[in-house]
């Protein structure tokens, strides 16, 4: 798997999506985990909806929320409130039984806020011993959520 | 009139089967969810299950303590939802619905149940 | 599973009274949450959904509110036909209900 560079902005929202082949994954689960180390294993960081069916209610854990789009295929991750520990290398994963499939491996960019003159130091970047070939950046763009949204896709 | 209409329910013996049918009308049954939901005699609901829409291909979930005893299917042509019962326990001695999960758009879902039938009594004894 | 906690298991009231039943989950649900209202012999009807929205055609004088644990259903002023067993339902881990509050005239 190549990996997907997101840069989100400290102090605001960072959207993340793994997009999948619905008809593949029909039926199973998603993660996102954070890998912990090269070789390390990747720690759990929220699952979807424990009901298949009901995957496209965005379930939090802490500061971080998963929705799965699974007919569209489309997995989508709201980093809220990005700080400088949030920033490393993360999974999309596919669950089945005991064993899951990576969808995306991603790498997490903590920029500096513009409007922030703090010192520039705690921002975490891959250093130059850290090689990610290939890797994609994708600049994310994304808003914060407004107080009281629906956790549903919109109405068409 | 959005109508759901249950059938099917009776008397019958512990490890015996039993299929009950919700006949839908008033509505677009492939763009719904359906759910079953029991209710024993004096006590609360309870979730059994539920298929999705059209969309999910007939797709089911069920509660840890149905699952692989009852199935849950669906006939779009004629409109009828199905909830087959096997290995039935005095347990599933109850009064049975079946509900349909409001709608917000194509293929999705709220698992908050708009309509329901009237139910049916199922009672397993010996 | 999430268990749900509805208090009180039933109540009396008056005619206009302001009535109100709690349901607390055993952990974090956000505001995945809705009300039913059930009559004797009758099957659920749906109130509230997402905590706090009105169902279509359902008077004004049933809400609900809450987030993360506790929830709260209000009926403003109570009335006859509003003599039932109410029931939480949530649906952030499988699909589960409070065990019912019997709302009674006095």
């Known amino acids: 798997h190549n990996t997907t560079v997101f840069q989100g902005v400290a102090g605001q929202s960072l959207q993340v999506s793994c997009p999948y082949d619905s008809m593949k994954h029909w039926g199973r689960r998603k993660a996102w985990c954070r890998q912990l180390g090269e070789k390390g294993p990747c720690q759990r960081v929220v699952s979807t909806h424990n009901l298949w069916l009901l995957s496209f209610l965005r379930r939090w854990n802490g500061s971080t929320a998963i929705t799965d789009d699974t007919l569209g295929g489309t997995l989508t991750i709201t980093l809220r409130n990005l700080q400088p520990h949030d920033a490393g290398l993360y999974q999309c994963q596919s669950l089945h039984g005991s064993e899951a499939d990576t969808l995306r491996k991603v790498l997490v960019e903590v920029l500096a806020d513009p409007l922030d003159h703090r010192d520039a130091g705690d921002l975490w970047f891959p250093g130059e011993s850290e090689s990610f070939e290939d890797a994609h950046v994708e600049h994310s763009i994304s808003r914060s959520l407004l107080e009281g949204e629906i956790p549903f896709p919109p109405t068409s | 009139e959005v109508q759901l209409v249950e059938s099917g329910g009776g008397l019958v013996q512990p490890g015996r089967s039993l299929r009950l049918s919700c006949t839908a009308s008033?509505?677009?049954?492939?763009?719904?969810?359906m759910s079953w939901f029991r209710q024993a005699p004096g006590k609360g609901l309870e979730w059994v299950g539920f298929?999705?829409?059209?969309?999910?291909?007939?797709?089911?979930e069920y509660t840890a303590s149905v699952k692989g005893r009852f199935t849950i299917s669906r006939d779009g042509s004629k409109s009828i939802a199905y909830l087959q019962m096997n290995s039935l326990k005095t347990e599933d001695t109850a009064v049975y619905y079946c509900?349909?999960?409001?709608?917000?758009?194509?293929?999705?879902?709220?698992?908050?149940?708009?309509?329901w039938g009237q139910g049916t009594m199922v009672t397993v004894s010996s | 599973d999430i268990q749900m906690t509805q208090s009180p298991s039933s109540l009396s009231a008056s005619v206009g009274d302001r009535v109100t039943i709690t349901c607390q989950a055993s952990?974090?649900?956000?505001?995945?949450l809705n009300w039913y209202q059930q009559k004797p012999g009758k099957a659920p009807k749906l109130l509230i959904y997402?905590?706090?929205n009105l169902e279509t055609g359902v008077p004004s004088r049933f809400s609900g509110s809450g987030s993360g644990t506790d929830f709260t259903f209000t009926i403003s002023s109570l009335q006859p036909e509003d003599i039932a067993t109410y029931y939480c339902?949530?649906?952030?881990?499988?699909?589960?209900f409070g065990g019912g509050t019997k709302v009674e005239i006095k």
């Open positions: 509900a349909r999960g409001k709608r917000y758009s194509y293929g999705y879902w709220h698992p908050a149940f708009d309509v």
């Open positions: 008033g509505f677009t049954f492939g763009d719904y969810a």
């Open positions: 298929i999705g829409s059209k969309a999910y291909g007939g797709t089911t």
């Open positions: 952990q974090d649900i956000t505001n995945y």
């Open positions: 997402d905590a706090s």
């Open positions: 339902q949530q649906y952030d881990s499988y699909l589960t």
